[in-house]
Interface confidence: low
């Protein structure tokens, strides 16, 4: 049985040209997270596997950074970055934990974080 | 249970546009997930051709994609196929399938054959 | 495109056997690979993804391995039921606007009995 929940960042935003981490929390299990997947609409951005560490795709080596933690840094924002994004958790023995953050990248300093939440 | 069925003719004219449509039950495609089509001409392997989210966002497979369409009818629960100016090469099994973020393509339906054929 | 080569495309075997499917990708997809068994007029079935892990419901027979470039699928002992086309499928991206590289399947690796 699945018991755990994931904690996001939530709906956030961001400045045009600044970067932004990407933070998912797996809690309430004591599954063993044996690798981390970060996705956008189904295109892989970064692969954190508990054996071999972590993997970037090549199309965002410039523009993004592991960590911190099992969490994501986007640099270099460009309002082609908005959308959603995806943390995959992949445990044993409960199975795949998914978190969603929408992220919106703005063209002038309007940006603020929104506030914390949970997915089941 | 999700199932997925297509439906649609099973016989084209070459330079037309073949249609099909997939029909989702036991899940509201609106809620989650990429909703592909996937085509597999006779006695060959498997071409991915295009999804369409559950928040109508489109992705095609660029060596199709100025022929393909997918698009979704919310209040039917189904999304739908359209590849243009058909020829021979495309007679093929077509299937609609979900994938699941991280997995791969986790629900199937069970293919329809469509022929190109004068 | 990234390429997925599948070689042998047949494999014969008999029940009982150890058999391991390759599969060659032409580019570094890290895990990103998934593994699918397909019967005769029947629909894939998802069986592996990212590289090793079995899917709900699938026997602990199968098994995946491999990171980078080179992905096996083993079968530990094989069943009747287990004859089938075995197709590796990589999961790395997909096309947006900026970024052209479709989800690809191998040809395929047929399983038959020996």
């Known amino acids: 049985m699945m018991t755990g929940t994931i904690e996001t960042t939530g709906n956030i935003s961001a400045e045009k040209g600044g970067s932004i981490i990407l933070q998912c929390h797996l809690s309430s299990t004591t599954a063993q997270v044996t690798q981390v997947n970060w996705e956008q609409q189904d295109q892989l951005l970064a692969i954190c596997n508990a054996d071999l560490g972590w993997h970037i795709s090549p199309s965002f080596k410039d523009r993004v950074a592991p960590g911190p933690g099992l969490g994501l840094t986007l640099q270099s924002l460009t309002v082609n970055d908005t959308g959603e994004y995806f943390c995959i958790y992949h445990t044993y023995p409960d199975g795949t934990y998914t978190g969603r953050i929408f992220l919106e990248v703005l063209e002038s300093s309007v940006a603020e974080h929104g506030a914390r939440f949970q997915i089941p | 249970q999700v199932k997925l069925q297509e439906s649609g003719p099973g016989l084209v004219k070459p330079s037309q546009t073949l249609s099909l449509t997939c029909t989702v039950t036991?899940?509201?495609?609106?809620?989650?997930?990429?909703w592909n089509w996937i085509r597999q001409p006779p006695g060959k392997g498997l071409e991915w051709i295009g999804y369409?989210?559950?928040?109508?966002?489109?992705s095609y497979n660029p060596s199709l994609k100025s022929r393909v369409t997918i698009s979704v009818d919310t209040s039917k629960n189904q999304f739908s196929l359209k590849l243009s100016s058909v020829t021979a090469a495309d007679t093929a099994v077509y299937s609609c399938?979900?994938?699941?973020?991280?997995?791969?393509?986790?629900?199937w339906g069970q293919g329809t054959l469509v022929t190109v054929s004068a | 495109d990234i390429q997925m080569t599948q070689s042998p495309s047949s494999l014969s075997a008999s029940v009982g056997d150890r058999v391991t499917i390759p599969c060659k990708a032409s580019?570094?997809?890290?895990?990103?690979v998934a593994w699918y068994q397909q019967k005769p007029g029947k629909a894939p079935k998802l069986l592996i993804y990212?590289?090793?892990y079995r899917y709900t419901g699938v026997p602990s027979r199968f098994s995946g391995s491999g990171s980078g470039t080179d992905f096996t699928l083993t079968i530990s002992s094989l069943q009747p039921e287990d004859f089938a086309t075995y197709y590796c499928?990589?999961?790395?991206?997909?096309?947006?606007?900026?970024?052209?590289?479709?989800?690809?399947f191998g040809e395929g690796t047929k399983l038959e009995i020996k």
């Open positions: 990212s590289s090793s």
């Open positions: 369409i989210t559950y928040s109508g966002g489109t």
């Open positions: 499928q990589q999961s790395y991206s997909t096309p947006q606007q900026h970024y052209s590289t479709p989800w690809t």
């Open positions: 399938a979900r994938r699941q973020i991280g997995l791969g393509f986790t629900y």
């Open positions: 036991g899940y509201s495609i609106t809620s989650d997930y990429a």
């Open positions: 580019q570094d997809l890290s895990t990103a």
